[in-house]
Interface confidence: low
Amino acid sequence: AVNGTSQFTCFYNSRANISCVWSQDGALQDTSCQVHAWPDRRRWNQTCELLPVSQASWACNLILGAPDSQKLTTVDIVTLRVLCREGVRWRVMAIQDFKPFENLRLMAPISLQVVHVETHRCNISWEISQASHYFERHLEFEARTLSPGHTWEEAPLLTLKQKQEWICLETLTPDTQYEFQVRVKPLQGEFTTWSPWSQPLAFRTKPAALGKDT
């Protein structure tokens, strides 16, 4: 049996994945639990097995189809349930009517690369992954650069208020190792949140030329 409060949070990646986390205060004894997605206007439904991510929370990904297929639209509503098996029955532990385009979290940007690097600046580009064509250009980005001797949390955030898949980092120190990350967010959706940060891209600025004033 399960007692205590329950929190059930899901996000849609805008294409073919709904990721869910279920948190439950109280003991859950060796019970098989799943998330079940039941769209209001689609013929398919989908399930995923909740796997523990901490002592009181479980997560899973509902794979709705091929990664770049558009499985849901702005008018869809998907009933999402946490179901746990009790003997031969499934007990509903949590339920929500999920509006996918109000609860967006895109995949982290990919394919980060250094386009051009100099002593004091570096031009970096990236690509968005599995993002719906519905957004057109209505995306924004945040970027951060890790400098030597600092942490990611200390890095100032650079905001790009448009769909711009490149950045030119200025005022860098010559011959210095840096790391760079970027994340993306659609402008649409009341509960939409930032994507995870991209994998860090390591780069090194060029050394200053000898005998020249830098």
Partner: nanobody, 123 residues
Framework: EVQLVESGGGLVQAGGSLRLSCVVS????????MAWFRQAPGKEREFVAA????????EYVDSVKGRFTVSRDNAKNTVYLQMNNLKPEDTAVYYC????????????????WGQGTQVTVSS
């Protein structure tokens, strides 16, 4: 093995109402998620509505939302389908279905079925 017996069908004019009942015997009723399906002449059997074992959660096909209400009385081993504002396109044989697996209830496979009751809506 579980047995299902439907009743309450009949002939009704468009805009009228009917209440279908399905009595379940042969097993513990609360083990089952219950559903109603329908099959019009020359068409495939289609999902209409479902109610979970507890009765707290219901599902409907879009075409009947706001007009049909599915419910159950676990003390009487009975599931109901209240059909209001009936339309000629609601004409079909209505079947009661039971499944212990919540996930499978919308599917026509692996359900236990009743024999069906005819609903005819005249214009």
């Amino acid at each position: 093995e579980v047995q299902l017996v439907e009743s309450g069908g009949g002939l009704v004019q468009a805009g009228g109402s009917l209440r279908l009942s399905c009595v379940v015997s042969g097993d513990v009723f609360v083990r089952y998620t219950m559903a109603w399906f329908r099959q019009a002449p020359g068409k495939e059997r289609e999902f209409v509505a479902a109610v979970t074992d507890s009765g707290r959660t219901t599902e409907y096909v879009d075409s009947v939302k706001g007009r049909f209400t599915v419910s159950r009385d676990n003390a009487k081993n009975t599931v109901y389908l209240q059909m209001n504002n009936l339309k000629p396109e609601d004409t079909a044989v209505y079947y009661c279905a039971a499944n212990t697996d919540y996930f499978q209830i919308r599917s026509v496979d692996n359900n236990a079925w009743g024999q069906g009751t005819q609903v005819t809506v005249s214009s």
